[in-house]
Interface confidence: low
Amino acid sequence: LPKAPVITTPLETVDALVEEVATFMCAVESYPQPEISWTRNKILIKLFDTRYSIRENGQLLTILSVEDSDDGIYCCTANNGVGGAVESCGALQVKMKPKITRPPINVKIIEGLKAVLPCTTMGNPKPSVSWIKGDSPLRENSRIAVLESGSLRIHNVQKEDAGQYRCVAKNSLGTAYSKVVKLEVEVFARILRAPESHNVTFGSFVTLHCTATGIPVPTITWIENGNAVSSGSIQESVKDRVIDSRLQLFITKPGLYTCIATNKHGEKFSTAKAAATISIAEWSKPQKDNKGYCAQYRGEVCNAVLAKDALVFLNTSYADPEEAQELLVHTAWNELKVVSPVCRPAAEALLCNHIFQECSPGVVPTPIPICREYCLAVKELFCAKEWLVMEEKTHRGLYRSEMHLLSVPECSKLPSMHWDPTACARLPHLDYNKENLKTFPPMTSSKPSVDIPNLPSSSSSSFSVSPTYSMT
């Protein structure tokens, strides 16, 4: 007899893991045999969909490899034309071990800002997300919170927040760990100890200290009156993210010294500045009746000739005394390239000490001229032949300018060291072996116009430039 369909095994809820097999059973009793159709969320499942297997006359529906999107309500409907169609429904709950879909990444953040380390997860049941810092579980507090999304938010990031982090996603089916990521906290450059201002006497040595910190460790540069410091020695040490810089100065003029600490954050820089003034007791700028001022030699041409950190007289009749006097020497030196090896060092010493005269500091800085005896030693012993040629060229107007006349002193007008030993400057570089005088070029006269002082003998067999000997 015809019998309307009856579902003897109603559908149940099926739990399945992603990629597992999931089967619904819809056992039907009827006569004639019913047609059974299946729907998912009220949409008909097509018989030829290869993701499904429909067997036992449609009573078994198997999902061959469960996917996330298979979650939903599945219904079977049986109809054999006798009576009405019958339906049974059940849910597929796709269970999924935790999966971290957006893992955290390494973060560099500036102290005080907000950091967010992402950790987006998938899983069913929904995974709970916790974080590990180093090897310990991370505790939440007023600054640190795990968001609903699983991301870690840190307000007002502190140095101690730096470290290695990973997120852990956990549900009843398993646990997923992210890879370890690094949170690096960068700190703006900050000056911990500013240089102190000083009021000192002319010619004093002063050390300016500047200590700074930051992450990364900053670099320290010193500025003198708006320009990079050109003289003085800088010593630096770094310990525990603190840099200590010491600038040692020989004070010949007042100035504003600025310590600048700089560090880099990505493409941007942060800087911190601190300044100190150096004033000189009883200092007055060169007056109009002052012809110049004393300063350390900062040029290049006379570096080998003048004593290290030599105090030289800079003539303020030039707009830029240092540059003008350096140019004078430079121009004159070019002429010396062709002179004899005996003459050249002596002439260089004379030129440098004549153009950059030793300076006597004081309320009125005073240049100290070269002693006449040293001038004559160069003129009549070392460079006799060359001197004649040069004077002749000068008188015949062969030089391009008057510069060379300025470069060569008139020996006869210079003070003698026998009058007042402190009134003139000696040339410590002149040193020759008296026994080798016969090798020098012939003199212009049978004897020098003035007694040439005895120079100490040295072991060298020819003229040499040496700062260790002086004429006494």
Epitope: L17, K97, S172, L173, G174, T175, Y177, K179, V180
Partner: antibody, heavy 121, light 107 residues
Framework: EVQLVESGGGLVKPGGSLRLSCAAS????????MDWVRQAPGKGLEWVSS????????YYADSVRGRFTISRDNAKNSLYLQMNSLRAEDTAVYYC??????????????WGQGTLVTVSS | DIQMTQSPSSLSASVGDRVTITCRAS??????VNWYQQKPGKAPKLLIY???TLQSGVPSRFSGSGSGTDFTLTISSLQPEDFATYYC?????????FGQGTKLEIK
Amino acid sequence: EVQLVESGGGLVKPGGSLRLSCAASGFTFSSYTMDWVRQAPGKGLEWVSSIGSNGDYIYYADSVRGRFTISRDNAKNSLYLQMNSLRAEDTAVYYCARGQLAVAGTHFDYWGQGTLVTVSS
Amino acid sequence: DIQMTQSPSSLSASVGDRVTITCRASQKVNKYVNWYQQKPGKAPKLLIYAASTLQSGVPSRFSGSGSGTDFTLTISSLQPEDFATYYCQQSYSPLSTFGQGTKLEIK
């Protein structure tokens, strides 16, 4: 047939270094997590280190962190353990093991025969 | 790190006996526990994974159970080849740890 063969063990002085190798065959090496487990003479098993299938994660036991380095070369089907600053307590048979992911965590379904490392002066 | 404490550390039994070895984790480890057998001079062999799943090729007299923190390995009827040392292992944490082992000896 899955095979894991360790090599590189031997006698080394304290403070010295040694590099262990594990040659894998019979399975798709690049699909599996690999681990090192050691066993001191007469003692129990101690997990040493683990490396993800493509080297994306690495873990070490506290006792070896900073001294040992695990690495792998998927092209050569090889796992390595570089051991530096060796101590007497590192003396053990070192096994490499294949990690198999299941519904609940990882288990070691295949093990090598082990290689003996002796640290002694 | 998660500690795994096995008990007893040694056990004497006879062929045919039912033997139970327990393992306790210092924190919940879900079902992330595996059991291994090791014979002298040999590499360990996987018996049970995911707390209760029998590894392919392992005799059915071996079974595992438990969830959370307490786990057991049971040998229903001891055979001569079963005398060995047994280890539990947790894989809940990426820093895996083993129990100290249980030596099963012939009485």
